[in-house]
């Protein structure tokens, strides 16, 4: 069973003192939502007792495996049932507590009743506040039965439950009619999986006889303890105050365990500390009576005397659970109560015996759980013991389960059962997950699922190149973090994967899957600079730049231009997917505006040093087009050009520029200035005889503008070759007046 | 379907005996307490007896003590009404009910159809 | 055992709204407790829960009828009266004699 115990501090005066612990000895508990163990949840389980609505509970975690919850205001908080939940995967583990209400018109006898399968469950309710008015009782919150008033029995309300099952477990309630919900008796039912002393799917299997009021799990047969007992069987008393599977636990305050409800997994349920009972668990046990809740007698033999808290202390030469043995019998000695071994191994078990006649090897053997009896290979004969050692065939699941080391001689004999837990190695489900990866490194996270049992105490990574037949490196790692794998080599593919072990000699499982995880490329280590630019329009900017010389070939893909405009808070990254590109036209810029600008090489996903940074203003945006643009020939050598000024001028126009291109020619297009800003009309001379051409223009007023639309012209006649174009310009009026 | 059902009603003379039956289906009968109900000709509801779910516990309303025995079978599933010394004043449709509980609450909410028991000479 | 006293007879028009009263002579009946549960029956037949815990409706039961306590009085209201309302409509309350108590009993009459 899970080693989960949910404690509730009763001392009631104040319920802002009361407090609810829940605290778990498995490993690894409580360590977080990751597969290595999921957190200790501890709530107040509303669906069946609901309470008016209050401040919310406080919760505290004290360290991995302990978690109290706070903040109770007022005692109708208290009422109810609260859970806690531990342990990870199939071991996960609910704890109950259900709280009754000291004020309440009815109380329970006994609040947790575990019963077998097919017994008759008794539920007593005694009356603290009488009413007359009928009792109803309620199972898991649902009408189930009502009593007469008058049906009471020396005072209690009893609700019989003849042939139980284990669906008629749950939460039950006893309530007057007319009284509030919180003033109900509340019960715990816990019906077994099976008839008394018997475990397993068809409860064919038969229990290890629990002692000191420890009950036998039906689904793993084994005992769950009450507090303050240990052992397979729990035949061993923990020191005053301790609790917990191996009583690593301690009761906290000076007071030791008193006042304290300690509940731990069905089918126990819940119960005082041993030493203590009463329904506040602050009573000591009557002379004669021990344990938890002082059910059990001491009935102690031969000068023994009895202790609360664990029972017969016998005098020497005497020993048993009431002193009955002489420690002539043969005894087994400080056999450990459970033992754990991973699957396939062969390990060796030893057994301890004293006695007179003194035991020998032959006189003590080791019988597995399917019956079969092992000898021992060799024993060690010390003065006042034999210790026998036994060679165990490789081990099977089917080994799980109680052994038991038995020593006969003619004074007698005895037998100590033991549990053998046999372990599967744990194999991982999943291949690890690749959380970064440089040029010559990759950052892993080995946490995965996995099947086979925890806990996880080692986790090697192994990895070799892709396609490799050369050995695999390994790297061992801490289960909880990630893991850098260093010294790899540039782009190139690796096959990685996960070996979980867990403690215990063959505790090495099989490896996981494979994944492939691949190195980045190399950095680009070259940083270039800025050799120039310049503005060609209000939003294009032109920029070249350069590279060191350096031996060997280039290693890049190609360039990223970044422009920063701090104004806005905006950065604009322009790709360039050439290495050999030395220059990059950058359009749809903004007017006017401050850029930083700079460039670095790229190579794959990586960027290489940046450029020093230049600084660039384009200027602010121009004038609309001129509008109605008409090219008119005026002779061989002479186009006269005539347009309207731009409409919604932001400013007063400084010049024009007009572009001419002979039509269908490859080469540049001429700009000529007409920096009479006035003038509606211009004549471009020196041009080619029957040459057509095109023409656009635009106005500047602190930058250039839009174009106008294109006109086309030819010039006339078969003149001379002119030298070039050139302009002349006037008012448009005074052009045609010529 | 949830229903109950007298039966056992007729014509009896004065100081003579008569047994209704109310059988329950559709619902577990052992667990609710059980009641019957009469109502005499052109007049109201008169409880009569009620009879807790364990059958070991009952009550009579006054005008019937000593003379009527509720009783209940619950393997069939069945409430009597045991009705001896009758008088003309017993003449009466009989109903059978169930008390039912919800968030505590108390009250009828299944009724059979009746039975009529008449007692005359 | 306690009595619950009724009207014997409430009557309205079609639409309108009428009340009627029942009230306790203990406080081991009405005043006690808040189990007020009120049931309808017309000639002929069994009777039906109407209203239970004073206030509470069964599903199926129309909107139209509602109910109320003050003190030692339970109400039952039929808002919107209509034809098939005309019934005998009993009050009854839990007794912790163990006896169901119920009301005298009241007829209403759709004028």
């Known amino acids: 069973a899970v080693d989960l115990t949910l404690l509730a501090n009763l001392r009631l005066t104040d319920p802002q003192r009361f407090f609810l612990t829940c605290v778990s000895g498995e490993a690894g508990a409580g360590r977080g939502s990751d597969a290595w163990g999921p957190p200790l949840l501890l709530e107040k389980d509303d669906r069946i007792v609901r309470t008016p609505p209050g401040p919310p509970l406080r919760l505290a975690r004290n360290g991995s495996h302990q978690v109290t919850l706070r903040g109770f205001s007022k005692p109708s908080d208290l009422v109810g049932v609260f859970s806690c939940v531990g342990g990870a995967g199939a071991r996960r583990t609910r704890v109950i507590y259900v709280h009754n209400s000291p004020g309440a018109h009815l109380l329970p006898d006994k609040v947790t009743h575990t019963v077998n399968k097919g017994d008759t469950a008794v539920l007593s309710a005694r009356v603290h506040k009488e009413k007359q008015t009928d009792v109803i009782w309620k199972s898991n919150g649902s009408y189930f039965y009502t009593l007469d008033w008058h049906e009471a029995q020396d005072g209690r309300f009893l609700l019989q439950l003849p042939n139980v099952q284990p669906p008629s477990s749950g939460i039950y309630s006893a309530t007057y009619l007319e009284a509030s919900p919180l003033g109900s008796a509340f019960f715990r039912l816990i019906v077994r999986g099976c008839g008394a002393g018997r475990w397993g799917p068809g409860c064919t299997k038969e229990c290890p006889g629990c002692l000191h009021g420890g009950v036998c799990h039906d689904h793993d047969g084994e005992c769950v303890c009450p507090p303050g007992f240990t052992g397979t069987r729990c035949e061993q008393a923990c020191r005053e105050g301790r609790f917990g599977q191996s009583c690593q636990e301690q009761c906290p305050g000076i007071s030791g365990c008193r006042g304290l409800t300690f509940c731990l997994p069905d089918p126990y349920g819940c119960s005082c500390g041993s030493g203590w009972r009463g329904s506040q668990c602050q009573e000591a046990c009557a002379p004669g009576h021990f344990g938890a809740d002082c059910r059990l007698q001491c009935q102690c033999q031969n000068g023994g005397t009895c202790d609360r808290f664990s029972g017969c202390v016998c005098p020497s030469g005497w020993h048993g659970v009431h002193c009955e043995k002489s420690d002539r019998i043969p005894q087994i000695l400080n056999m450990a109560s459970e033992l754990e071994f991973n699957l396939e191994t062969m390990p060796r078990i030893n057994c301890a015996a004293a006695g007179n006649p003194f035991p020998v090897r032959g006189s003590i053997e080791l019988r597995k759980p399917d019956g079969t009896v092992l000898l021992s290979t060799k024993a060690i004969v010390e003065p006042e013991k034999t210790t026998a050692e036994f060679e165990v065939p490789r081990l099977v699941l089917a080994d799980s389960g109680f052994w038991e080391c038995r020593v006969s001689t003619s004074g007698g004999q005895d037998s100590r059962r033991f549990k053998v837990n046999v372990k599967v190695p744990p194999v991982p489900l999943a291949a690890p997950r690749l959380l970064t990866k440089q040029s010559r490194q990759l950052v892993v996270s080995p946490l995965v699922s996995f099947s086979g049992d925890g806990p996880i105490s080692t986790v090697r990574l192994h990895y070799r190149p892709q396609d490799s037949t050369m050995d695999w490196s390994t790297i061992v790692v801490d289960p909880s973090e990630n893991v850098t794998l260093m010294n790899l080599r540039p782009k190139t593919g690796y096959s990685v994967r996960v070996q979980l072990s867990r403690p215990g000699e063959g505790g090495e499982g099989a490896w996981g899957p494979p994944t492939l995880m691949t190195t980045d490329c190399p950095e680009p280590l070259l940083q270039p600079w800025l050799e120039g630019w310049h503005v060609e329009g209000t939003d294009r900017l032109r920029v070249s730049w350069s590279l060191p010389l350096v031996p060997g070939p280039l290693v890049g893909d190609g360039f990223l231009l970044r422009l920063w405009d701090g104004t806005r808070g905006q950065e604009r990254r322009e790709n360039v997917s050439s290495p050999q590109a030395r220059t990059a036209l950058l359009t749809g810029l903004t007017p006017g505006t401050h850029y930083q600008l700079d460039v670095q090489l790229y190579h794959c996903t990586l960027l290489g040093p940046a450029s020093p940074p230049a600084h660039v203003l384009l200027p602010p945006s121009g004038p609309p087009a001129p509008r109605h643009l008409h090219a008119q020939a005026l002779s061989d050598s002479e186009i006269q050009l005539t347009w309207k000024h731009p409409e919604a001028l932001p400013g007063p126009i400084s010049k024009y520029v007009v572009e001419v291109q002979v039509a269908g020619g490859a080469g540049d297009p001429l700009w000529i200035d007409v920096d009479r800003p006035e003038e509606t009309s211009t004549i471009i001379r020196g041009l080619n005889a029957s040459t057509r051409y095109l023409f656009r223009m635009r106005a500047s007023i602190q930058g250039l503008g839009d174009w106008s639309n294109t006109v086309e012209e030819s010039t006339l006649g078969n003149g001379l070759q002119a030298e070039g174009p050139v302009q002349e310009s006037r008012a448009a009026e005074e052009g045609l007046d010529q | 379907e949830v229903q109950l059902l007298e039966s056992g009603g007729g014509l009896v003379q004065p100081g003579g005996s008569l047994r209704l039956s109310c059988a329950a289906s559709?619902?577990?009968?052992?667990?609710?307490?059980m009641i019957w109900v009469r109502q005499a000709p052109g007049k109201g509801l008169e409880w009569v007896s009620v009879?807790?779910?364990?059958?070991?516990?009952?009550r009579y309303a006054d005008s019937v003590k000593g003379r009527f025995t509720i009783s209940r079978d619950n393997s069939k599933n069945t409430l009597y009404l045991q009705m001896n010394s009758l008088r003309a004043e017993d003449t009466a449709v009989y109903y059978c009910?169930?008390?039912?509980?919800?968030?505590?609450?108390?009250?009828?909410?299944?009724w059979g159809r009746g039975t009529l028991v008449t007692v005359s000479s | 055992q306690s009595v619950l006293t009724q009207p014997a007879s409430v009557s309205g028009s079609p639409g309108q709204s009428i009340t009627i009263s029942c009230t306790g002579t203990?406080?081991?009946?009405?005043?006690?407790?808040?189990?007020v549960s009120w049931y309808q029956q017309h000639p002929g037949k069994a009777p039906k829960l109407l209203i239970y815990?004073?206030?509470n409706r069964p599903s199926g039961v129309s909107n139209r009828f509602s109910g109320s306590k003050s003190g030692n009085t339970a109400s039952l209201t039929i808002s919107g009266l209509q034809a098939e309302d005309e019934a005998d409509y009993y009050c009854?309350?839990?007794?912790?004699?163990?006896?169901?108590?119920f009301g005298t009993g009241t007829k209403v009459t759709v004028l």
């Open positions: 009910t169930r008390r039912v509980y919800s968030s505590g609450s108390a009250y009828f909410d299944l």
């Open positions: 009854s309350s839990y007794a912790s004699s163990g006896a169901r108590v």
């Open positions: 009879i807790y779910p364990s059958g070991g516990h009952t």
């Open positions: 559709g619902f577990t009968f052992s667990i609710y307490p």
């Open positions: 203990s406080s081991d009946d009405v005043g006690g407790y808040n189990y």
């Open positions: 815990d004073v206030i």
